[in-house]
């Protein structure tokens, strides 16, 4: 795809290796460019799938660095988008280099849920706090949301007790267990176990992509309080 300002196919080299990386729904485009005697500037455009009369929208114009944050130009994070990048040197422009198809929800990474555990009488209470992401500049949790298909559908919770591991599943749609801030799991304390270590990861709806796994949080129950 040639722009109107292109002055011949080989006058300005095309950017290469256009890639998109997304962490916590914050997608950034990266590309490579050969060293030039004159400083090149780049224009980055985004096209969203599923948007009526979808057109290429400018995300970054005439920038000199080799990356562009496109988070303000993403519609539904479940939908596909494409990116194209062109270079300009002086008055001459390159052809566009195009990215592969990318869906923020499918191809991006989401950070881990935060965990807290505590002992309440004869139970271990585990709080799993939804990861926070930025969507169109607003911080929000990736909890169950019927308005979108990009949410955490289930948490896999891994509990190690004195060496053996049990996996629990928490469905985020269950209002008894979850709200818009966190999910909660209660495990009975056994007199045979004094040490409990817990980690968790979220599983996204539709594609089954998993978030990063939380760090493992442990408690050791003092001997005197587990007897009887």
């Amino acid at each position: 795809e040639m722009g109107t300002a292109d002055l011949g196919p080989s006058s300005v080299p095309t950017p290469t290796n256009v890639t998109i990386e997304s962490y916590n729904m914050n997608p950034i485009v990266y590309w490579e460019y050969q060293i030039m005697p004159q400083v090149p500037v780049f224009t980055v455009e985004v096209k969203n799938y599923g948007v009526k009369n979808s057109e290429w929208i400018d995300a970054c114009i005439n920038i000199s660095h080799h990356y562009c944050n496109i988070s303000d130009h993403v519609g539904d994070p479940s939908n596909s988008l494409w990116v194209r990048v062109k270079a300009r040197v002086g008055q001459k422009e390159s052809a566009y280099a195009k990215s592969e198809e990318f869906a923020v929800c499918r191809d991006g990474k989401i950070g881990p849920p935060k965990l807290d555990i505590r002992k309440e009488e004869k139970q271990i209470m585990i709080d799993i706090f939804h990861p926070s992401v930025f969507v169109n500049g607003d911080e929000q949790e990736v909890d169950y949301d019927p308005e979108t298909t990009c949410y955490i559908r289930v948490y896999n919770v891994y509990v190690r007790m004195n060496g053996s591991e049990i996996q629990y599943k928490i469905l985020t749609q269950k209002e008894d267990d979850c709200d818009e801030i966190q999910c909660q799991l209660a495990i009975p304390v056994s007199s045979l176990n004094s040490q409990y270590c817990v980690s968790a990861e979220g599983v996204l709806h539709v594609w089954g992509v998993t978030t990063e796994k939380s760090k493992e949080v442990c408690i050791t129950i003092f001997n005197s309080s587990i007897k009887g």
């Epitope: 493992e216 442990c218 408690i219 003092f222």
Partner: nanobody, 124 residues
């Protein structure tokens, strides 16, 4: 995050003693409870002793070391100690310290922030 360096381990005969030290970097040392753990190859780390964040505060000891081990801390030196007396061959392990939170009936910690540990070997 607090960096932890354990020292003071060594080879000692049964009935002997050692004093382990755990030096912490970071100005927030005094706000953390501290725990000493030990690990034998192939087994889970076990909590040996814990101390609450304030100097002279609460302490906890595993049944197997009660009366023989003493945990203490010096917040001015960012250091926690484990005095080990009347050592037994079953005390042989790598000893680690970690930061955590001390509650009335449990010690909570992240299973991440570990130093390299110090080897204690008790010969019979």
């Amino acid at each position: 995050e607090v960096q932890l360096v354990e020292s003071g381990g060594g080879l000692v005969q049964a009935g002997g003693f050692l004093r382990l030290s755990c030096a912490a970097s970071g100005r927030t040392f005094s706000s953390y409870a501290m725990g000493w753990f030990r690990q034998i190859p192939g087994k889970e780390r076990e909590l040996v002793a814990a101390i609450s964040s304030w100097s002279g505060g609460s302490t906890y000891y595993a049944d197997s070391v009660k009366g023989r081990f003493t945990i203490s801390r010096d917040n001015a030196k960012n250091t926690v100690y484990l005095q080990m007396l009347s050592l037994k061959p079953e005390d042989t392990a790598v000893y680690y310290c970690t930061t955590g939170d001390y509650y009335s009936d449990y010690f909570k910690y992240d299973n991440e922030n570990w130093g390299k540990g110090t080897q204690v070997t008790v010969s019979s």
